[in-house]
Amino acid sequence: VPRWRQQWSGPGTTKRFPETVLARCVKYTEIHPEMRHVDCQSVWDAFKGAFISKHPCNITEEDYQPLMKLGTQTVPCNKILLWSRIKDLAHQFTQVQRDMFTLEDTLLGYLADDLTWCGEFNTSKINYQSCPDWRKDCSNNPVSVFWKTVSRRFAEAACDVVHVMLNGSRSKIFDKNSTFGSVEVHNLQPEKVQTLEAWVIHGGREDSRDLCQDPTIKELESIISKRNIQFSCKNIYRPDKFLQCVKNPEDSSCTSEI
């Protein structure tokens, strides 16, 4: 009887995945002096070892531990920016506000950002044709488990005031099923984190509503308060102006509400 490989519902491994991970690692370690000691070949070997020859629906956080160890990085714990469903603006912000960090500004987040990968049980092959979809196939797939692992560690490292950027254009501004809602919120350490400050980003030009009163934001406040962490919320009515004012805080128009 011919053996047929499992056909998954999600897209296959990103093209040139091994080359991309290695190249990103080299680039990151060149730009960030504190990570110059990292051996990128060892990083790739550890990354590969987390999912190669393993069933792509049976990946665990333990599988990624060798990679986590190699990618250990200290970021200022009071300068962490989380985000949900608004990655591009969050990244634009940290590109300007250089002393703040999203997960994708760390080595491990940078390596995997926007990539998909999976292997096959009992073979050394990477699957370029299909990978498990989180909803349709399984949640313990290589990509989902990776982001769950690094997101948990990132949230655990946070201290003082933690910021989170949320998308005010979504029907659920705070979504309990997002990585932020299901992982990061629950791994902020109350003994280290004083406040979670949400920045709700407005989409429409004329949208002057107070989205901090949205029921899902109230739900977030309730979850955070129960964890003995204070909560605050700000509307960012004009994201374009917000970014401009981060670049040029002295600009006279930046004293008004953005």
Epitope: P2, R5, Q7, P11, G12, F17, I126, Y128, S130
Partner: antibody, heavy 122, light 112 residues
Framework: QVQLQQSGPGLVKPSQTLSLTCVIS??????????WNWIRQSPSRGLEWLGR?????????DYAVSVESRIIVNPDTSKNQFSLQLNSVTPEDTAVYYC????????????WGQGTMVTVSS | NFMLTQPHSVSESPGKTVTIPCTRS????????VQWYQQRPDSSPIIVIY?????PSGVPDRFSGSIDSSSNSASLTISGLKTEDEAAYYC??????????FGGGTKLTVLG
């Protein structure tokens, strides 16, 4: 069973566009597992994979580097077929052209069209 | 891009065993599946081996595929040769772009 039926002209003038069509029966061009490929074969270049189209929530195309600047592979869901367009042809493009299905559960081609001999000549 | 190199031709007598190698020029052969196709004159290719060593239904078990990492090559072995096995055989693989590459083909002649 799955069958692929090719059609298109056998003679194309240099600098013009080569157009071939492959009609699918027994499967769907919009299948979430299969990919639909074009391959050509000539004495000088042997078998050469040219490109594919496939649907995974949206349409995707992949093209061989050797032809990527002049190839388009398009699905036609209404007719359950896919086509090859190769622009700016030269005599080097003279070959037998095949359409073929990659079923998705292995990296190979399990069903092939009958082949179309295309000559590029003035 | 990588290349897959095959001998131009091989010949063997009926009943014997023949092995056709396919050597990958760059990249590790074991990291990417290899397929084998049979093509008789004036016919379209037919897949006889996929995923290195799997036989599609309908292909006789006289056909087998293998991988040799030490030589970075794949092989197609046909045992108990029959005159109907006379054809061209092509290996095929891919790289991390999932672009496919075929070997140059090997003409198998069954003697006698």
């Amino acid at each position: 069973q799955v069958q692929l039926q090719q059609s298109g002209p056998g003679l194309v003038k240099p600098s013009q566009t080569l157009s071939l069509t492959c009609v699918i029966s027994g499967d769907s061009v919009s299948s979430n597992s299969a990919a639909w490929n074009w391959i050509r074969q000539s004495p000088s270049r042997g078998l050469e994979w040219l490109g594919r189209t496939y649907y995974r929530s949206k349409w995707h195309n992949d093209y061989a580097v050797s032809v990527e600047s002049r190839i388009i592979v398009n699905p036609d869901t209404s007719k359950n077929q896919f086509s090859l367009q190769l622009n700016s042809v030269t005599p080097e493009d003279t070959a037998v052209y095949y359409c073929a299905r990659d079923p998705g559960y292995f990296y190979g081609l399990d069903v092939w069209g009958q082949g179309t001999m295309v000559t590029v000549s003035s | 891009n990588f290349m897959l190199t095959q001998p131009h031709s091989v010949s063997e007598s009926p009943g014997k065993t023949v092995t056709i190698p396919c050597t990958r020029s760059s990249g590790t052969i074991a990291d990417y599946y290899v397929q084998w196709y049979q093509q008789r004159p004036d016919s379209s290719p037919i897949i006889v081996i996929y995923d290195d060593n799997q036989r599609p239904s309908g292909v006789p078990d006289r056909f087998s595929g293998s991988i040799d990492s030490s030589s970075n090559s794949a092989s197609l072995t046909i045992s108990g040769l029959k005159t109907e096995d006379e054809a061209a055989y092509y290996c095929q693989s891919y790289d991390s772009t999932n672009h496919w590459v075929f070997g140059g083909g090997t003409k198998l002649t069954v003697l006698g």
